[in-house]
Amino acid sequence: WELTILHTNDVHSRLEQTSEDSSKCVNASRCMGGVARLFTKVQQIRRAEPNVLLLDAGDQYQGTIWFTVYKGAEVAHFMNALRYDAMALGNHEFDNGVEGLIEPLLKEAKFPILSANIKAKGPLASQISGLYLPYKVLPVGDEVVGIVGYTSKETPFLSNPGTNLVFEDEITALQPEVDKLKTLNVNKIIALGHSGFETDKLIAQKVRGVDVVVGGHSNTFLYTGNPPSKEVPAGKYPFIVTSDDGRKVPVVQAYAFGKYLGYLKIEFDERGNVISSHGNPILLNSSIPEDPSIKADINKWRIKLDNYSTQELGKTIVYLDGSSQSCRFRECNMGNLICDAMINNNLRHADEMFWNHVSMCILNGGGIRSPIDERNNGTITWENLAAVLPFGGTFDLVQLKGSTLKKAFEHSVHRYGQSTGEFLQVGGIHVVYDLSRKPGDRVVKLDVLCTKCRVPSYDPLKMDEIYKVILPNFLANGGDGFQMIKDELLRHDSGDQDINVVSTYISKMKVIYPAVEGRIKFS
């Protein structure tokens, strides 16, 4: 019996087609993805093949102005229109709290939303009961397929799920649910979830009875043969894991941002064993036309976005200096504003020992593309922020050793004075440079804000300690020459859309007046 699994993950609000790098579409003839194009391909496969499932492995939320404005209603509407069969909860589905998940998505979705390792407690338990499920048995042709969901157990550190949701270990939580499916005589089981490729592989290895793993979170691109675009494969598609009980389990993921549609064909024998698996992600490029009816619906929903981008978010009573003359040479108040917003967006009270789980921010000065003049009645709009942060990136959470951070700050000034973008703006860090010293030895003082303290204060950076840092995804991926970050990071979790982080902070503060306050000094 042959099953076709179509899958997406980490779409992150890319409802409209995008450029090849998943930023805003500029030249329509070269654009990719988007739900209208996705629908065309899905329908084409549904017409051609008998047993098809369309699955999403989480993180539909967060990433463009679509989410900022519609807050998840757009996800429910267009996923319903595409007739998704199931979705797993990702960490970003909790970005607007549990209410921001329940009302727009859980209550509106016409497909099951799954996670076996999220357990509700207290007053939330009855409120959310039945709105998401640990698993769902789906009829496919004459057969049934069990889909069991999972979500990153790190979600409380990455989003805002509140105190009434417990995120259990994925493997521990999945096994009893899979066992339950087996007792219901379901012998074809897909684990669909959002914990990253390493965890996906562990699930394939450790959870008895899982036949296929469809994952997300790590934006992993897998491909067999010559890849069709710029993404470099992390392995073959499907990636085969040998389970502890001796079975070959295919593991798949489909990069991110709706650029590809994962396409996996599985052949099962009469006992429910996977006897063959093959496929590849399908690049959703302009050779695939956008479906006219979905496109028309997108255009209708688009109108509200255009209105939103000119509305006032808040006010500034000072000039927001985002000029390259400042931000690539010294501390600039636009850099301070953005870093403060980044930390504020990551406030998660960990426990009594920690005031927060992260206190530090770094931001490449070259990523700040425009100032904002306060003399326009102080008004700040989304449109203004889009000029400051035009690249559609994310502000991510990484874990780095102190020694890696030291290298990063040396790189920040290794060719100082040439107006290059690698000069770092900071938050929760005090750095002193001596430019008279040779490159690679210019950082003379590097103090960082403690997290394991009730009163935050600055302590010298320890080379062997592991620190959490918020930074642009551009830096996490080694951009602007920060190869040491890419090579040495110990963990990387993608975060929220950059503009959204700053706009939310400005809306929250109402009036802002960031200063230059001695975060970066020269001796």
């Epitope: 004459d142 057969e143 070959k248 024998d269 006992r271 064993n273 996977v274 063959s276």
Partner: antibody
Framework: QVQLQQSGAEVVKPGASVKISCKAS????????INWVKQRPGKGLEWIGK????????DYNGNFKGKATLTADKSSSTAYMQLSSLTSEDSAVYFC?????WGQGTLVTVSA | DIQMTQSPSSLSASLGERVSLTCRAS??????LIWLQQEPDGTFKRLIY???SLDSGVPKRFSGSSSGSDYSLTISRLESEDFVDYYC?????????FGGGTKLEIK
């Protein structure tokens, strides 16, 4: 659990036909191919062909086209193989098989 | 048609010994290979599917692997019930084809 139960041994005359059956249980019969295999002592195993009961699709080994005819009855979850114009070369044990499970075999003896 | 050349055709070995049987495919079969065990009464049992996946209920002393066009079944420590016949079967392309079989005998 999955079971494939074949009909009993047959003794047939040369030139005649024989139809052997394979009743399936423990799974959705219409969703999986049923294979037929021939085993003769000292001749190893030969794949005859397969049938997809859901729509009756068949796929034959060229060596058995015209010799074997595969059919299936969804209502009784039974697959059939008819062998025609029998000769002594057709004397063998015939097995039906899924991908995982095999029938117990049916001995066909062609003898005058 | 894809030829499956199975070797050895017979093998004498002792209890507790480790043995390997090999099937060589004449064309690429993309790991679509089954190993079957046939009891003296004619009963077939599948041991391995998809080259290396172990069927449920099959002892872990059985394992399958591949290297290029060579596919192997290894029994790590022979037990008395293992002295029977073994066949490989490719299901990559029609007509499916079997190896000639290996008779495993006790020394």
């Amino acid at each position: 659990q999955v079971q494939l139960q074949q009909s009993g041994a047959e003794v047939v005359k040369p030139g005649a036909s024989v139809k052997i059956s394979c009743k399936a249980s423990g799974y959705v019969f219409s969703s999986y191919w049923i294979n037929w295999v021939k085993q003769r002592p000292g001749k190893g195993l030969e794949w005859i062909g397969k049938i997809f009961p859901g729509n009756g699709d068949t796929d034959y080994n060229g060596n058995f086209k015209g010799k074997a005819t595969l059919t299936a009855d969804k209502s009784s979850s039974t697959a059939y193989m008819q062998l025609s114009s029998l000769t002594s070369e057709d004397s063998a044990v015939y097995f039906c098989a899924g991908f995982a499970d095999w029938g117990q075999g049916t001995l066909v003896t062609v003898s005058a | 048609d894809i030829q499956m050349t199975q070797s050895p055709s017979s093998l004498s070995a002792s209890l507790g010994e480790r043995v390997s049987l090999t099937c060589r495919a004449s064309q690429d079969i993309g790991e679509r290979l089954i190993w079957l065990q046939q009891e003296p009464d004619g009963t077939f049992k599948r041991l391995i599917y998809a080259t290396s996946s172990l069927d449920s209920g099959v002892p872990k002393r059985f394992s399958g692997s591949s290297s290029g066009s060579d596919y192997s079944l290894t029994i790590s420590r022979l037990e008395s019930e293992d002295f029977v016949d073994y066949y490989c079967l490719q299901y990559a392309s029609s007509p499916y084809t079997f190896g000639g079989g290996t008779k495993l005998e006790i020394k």
